[in-house]
Interface confidence: low
């Protein structure tokens, strides 16, 4: 049986080496000579030769200083053999424990720790945690028992001890009220970690604490009074720009301004926020009415996008807005008026009344009417009432002034405001047709060849509208039928064919042609016919003396 006492060896031992650790014994040494050897880590496996044993005495020795932080325990096996080399014992496991010395100082896990805390945070608020490690034995010794302390705080304002650190955990917390980002946005702490519960080896690191913004500053108007003016009736007009300052972090919800008009009951105004500089832009939400109110005294409050974190007074500004008078033009109702009237409407009679209204219901200004455009000079207007009458006969067939049976006149209404304002209305007279035009032939001048004359087509034209037009009736009168014949060229009788009954002499002839429309309105038209010295289809030939009733008359 083996006799092996517990083995421990301090690290970092001074020499001389080798140094006895313990004597190993086998009780078989009573029976004969026993020889000892060791195997295992530190003996015959790396690190080889750290431990040796005296072969005959069994003294286990260490040959060099140990480093617990490298190898904290060694496991060896002791062997005992007789002089003939036979084992007298089974191998025995030997555990060598390296005992710790405080040979390592704490090491922070980072050189610089970063943390943040909201301004105004109450004492006890956790900010961040710093961590250090120590390679020494923290189980059996205090060599790795780290204690944390704050060595310095920069700035030391508003108090030199704004933060505290938990000695054991390294958690940094707020210990004093008064954190204010706007005054001191960052703090730099030098923190220390020391072993032996703070009494031993030490090291330092830096903790940088950023104080984050809360909405603890209100936006403040500067100045608090403003003046502006705006013309009446115009919406979305910028009146003035409101200026605010806010000490909170720019371009954050705690800085961004929200403007509220406290006494805009009719929703006449709106304030929007300029996202770049936080200005308030006061505009009209709808057109203002000078006649109703010439001056507004607006009270505008400003807050932030997010609520105030603390009890703060809301800043207000006073804006005096003067409304400028604009004389509004009268408005014709409707802007375009259509009136149907017969083209034979009596001269001097009233056709219609066309009036305009003042845009402001309550301002009863006097309106005067006049005709601005009446190209045919057919109309006149009562300047006070807007009653429109004819001053001349209307004519639907006046194609210079009437388009598609419609005569367009422009009427203007002028008020007695200052300055005078004028509105325009369009009067459309839809002229209904009367049968005041008889049919006429087209063309009226016709050429025939003396030899083999080609019949000529004559169109019948009537400026009126159906039913005062086709079918037409044609008839040769005053003896013209002696030398000429006509026949209808189409079923609607809107054209006829004229041809001579016999060979005619070269010369000019006059033919009387009576044309009658569907309503029996007729008219006799003289056709001028030239017989030319030619054959077939005629061109234009020289003029000769006219011939009445289709007969040549001597000069």
């Amino acid at each position: 049986d083996w006799v092996i006492p517990p083995i421990s060896c301090p690290e970092n031992e001074k020499g001389p080496f080798p140094k006895n650790l313990v004597q190993i014994k086998s009780n078989k040494d009573k029976e004969g000579k026993v020889f000892y050897s060791i195997t295992g880590q530190g003996a015959d496996t790396p690190p080889v030769g750290v431990f040796i044993i005296e072969r005959e005495t069994g003294w286990l020795k260490v040959t060099e200083p140990l480093d617990r932080e490298r190898i904290a325990t060694y496991t060896l096996f002791s062997h005992a053999v007789s002089s003939n080399g036979n084992a007298v014992e089974d191998p025995m496991e030997i555990l060598i424990t390296v005992t710790d010395q405080n040979d390592n100082k704490p090491e922070f896990t980072q050189e610089v720790f970063k943390g943040s805390v909201m301004e105004g945070a109450l004492p006890g608020t956790s900010v961040m945690e710093v961590t250090a490690t120590d390679a020494d034995d923290d189980v059996n010794t205090y060599n790795a028992a780290i204690a944390y302390t704050i060595l310095s705080q920069d700035p030391e304002l508003p108090d030199k001890n704004m933060f505290t650190i938990n000695r054991n955990t390294g958690v940094i917390s707020v210990v004093t009220t008064g954190l204010d980002r706007e005054s001191f946005p960052t703090y730099t702490l030098v923190v220390q970690a020391a072993d032996l519960q703070g009494e031993g080896l030490s090291t330092t690191a830096t903790a940088v604490i950023t104080v984050t913004d809360t909405n603890d500053n209100p936006p403040i108007f500067n100045p608090t009074t403003y003046k502006g003016q705006v013309p009446e009736n115009e919406a979305n007009v910028v009146i003035t720009t409101l200026k605010v300052t806010d000490a909170d972090a720019p371009n954050t919800p705690a800085w961004e301004a929200v403007y509220t008009i406290l006494n805009d009951d009719g929703g006449q105004f709106v304030v929007t926020t300029n996202p770049v500089n936080n200005d308030g832009i006061l505009k009209t939400a709808k057109g203002l009415d000078f006649e109703a109110k010439q001056q507004y005294i607006l009270h505008v409050a400003v807050t932030n996008v997010v609520p105030f974190e603390v009890s703060l007074t809301t800043s207000t500004a006073t804006v005096t807005v003067d409304v400028l008078d604009v004389n509004e033009a009268p408005i014709f109702v409707p802007p375009e008026k259509r009136v149907e009237v017969s083209e034979d409407f009596g001269v001097g009679q009233e056709i219609t009344s066309y009036t305009a209204q003042e845009p402001d219901t309550f301002m009863e200004q006097k309106i005067t009417y006049r005709i601005w455009r009446d190209t045919a000079n057919w109309l006149e207007i009562n300047p006070d009432t807007g009653a429109i009458s004819t001053r001349a006969e209307l004519d639907r067939e006046d194609f210079e002034h009437v388009k598609n049976s419609t005569y367009t006149a422009l009427i203007i209404a002028t008020d007695n405001g200052s300055p005078v304002a004028t509105g325009t209305g369009t009067l459309l007279l839809i002229l209904s047709d009367v049968n005041d035009n008889a049919p006429i032939p087209e063309p009226r001048t016709i050429f025939f060849c003396e030899r083999n004359p080609k019949p000529q087509v004559i169109n019948i034209i009537d400026a009126d509208l159906p039913p005062n037009t086709s079918p037409f009736t044609a008839e040769l009168t005053h003896g013209a039928s002696a030398n000429w014949t006509i026949q209808y060229n189409d079923p609607t009788q809107e054209s006829i064919i004229l041809k001579p009954k016999m060979a005619l002499e070269v010369g000019d002839y006059k033919i009387n042609l009576k044309l009658m429309d569907n309503q029996n309105k007729d008219q006799v038209t003289t056709l001028e016919v030239s017989v030319c010295d030619c054959e077939g289809a005629a061109g234009v030939c020289r003029k000769a003396q006219p011939v009445e009733a289709g007969l040549q008359i001597p000069a």
Epitope: G266, G267, Q294, Q295, T361, F362
Partner: antibody, heavy 116, light 107 residues
Framework: EVQLQQSGPELLKPGASVKISCKAS????????MHWVKQSHGKSLEWIGN????????GYNQKFKTKATLTVDNSSSTAYMELRSLTSEDSAVYYC?????????WGQGTLVTVSA | DIVMTQSQKFMSTSVGDRVSVTCKAS??????VAWYQQKPGQSPKALIY???YRYSVVPDRFTGSGSGTDFTLPISNVQSEGLADYFC?????????FGGGTKLEIK
């Protein structure tokens, strides 16, 4: 021609409610605020509140906030004022009047009498 | 609330005379004041708005003046139909408030 036609006189018992009407014509109903004004016998005028028919927005005199409720029916161009929990103090002539701020036209008035 | 004070409850005048009805505001109301005439048994009628602007169809015997806190309604060439109550109104801020009224009597 602008006209405001108010409903007829009312005789009511204490604790009752009444809804008086004001029918407008001759202008665009939604363009102007409709105001309501109280005139007690032999006394001055008191502004009750107004309603903007365009969006139904209202403004009240705090004194009448729990007494009066203003509504409109744009389809019939009619404004209404309901008075509740009537007492003898509510006996008065009530006028409707239009104008976005000052009152250009007034109704003929509705006499409300509260008597046990 | 803004208080509108018409210090004279009654005023007596003769036909053809000139008389001035006054109204004082408890704080600055700029020119946001209107004047109304109320004849016995009738609704009030607008005379003046924005302190000095005569309302349509109102005779030019009625004028208005003032701004800030002091306002006057001068009536010249008083006629017998001028027998009425005259009220001022401020409309700068809610609640709108009327003066207590001035009764004009014809001698």
């Amino acid at each position: 021609e602008v006209q405001l036609q108010q409903s007829g006189p009312e005789l009511l018992k204490p604790g009752a409610s009444v809804k008086i009407s004001c029918k407008a014509s001759g202008y665009t109903f939604t363009d102007y605020n409709m105001h309501w004004v109280k005139q007690s016998h032999g006394k001055s005028l008191e502004w009750i509140g107004n309603i903007y028919p365009y969006n139904g927005g209202t403004g009240y005199n705090q004194k009448f906030k729990t007494k009066a409720t203003l509504t409109v029916d744009n389809s019939s161009s009619t404004a209404y004022m309901e008075l509740r929990s009537l007492t003898s103090e509510d006996s008065a002539v009530y006028y409707c009047a239009i104008g976005n701020y000052w009152f250009a036209f007034w109704g003929q008035g509705t006499l409300v009498t509260v008597s046990a | 609330d803004i208080v509108m004070t018409q210090s004279q409850k009654f005023m007596s005048t003769s036909v053809g005379d000139r008389v001035s009805v006054t109204c004082k505001a408890s704080q600055n109301v700029a020119i946001n004041v209107a004047w109304y005439q109320q004849k016995p048994g009738q609704s009030p009628k607008a005379l003046i708005y924005s302190a000095s602007y005569r309302y349509s169809v109102v005779p030019d015997r009625f004028t208005g003046s003032g701004s800030g806190t002091d306002f006057t309604l001068p009536i010249s060439n008083v006629q017998s139909e001028g027998l009425a109550d005259y009220f001022c109104l401020q409309y700068i801020n809610y609640p709108y408030t009327f003066g207590g009224g001035t009764k004009l009597e014809i001698k």
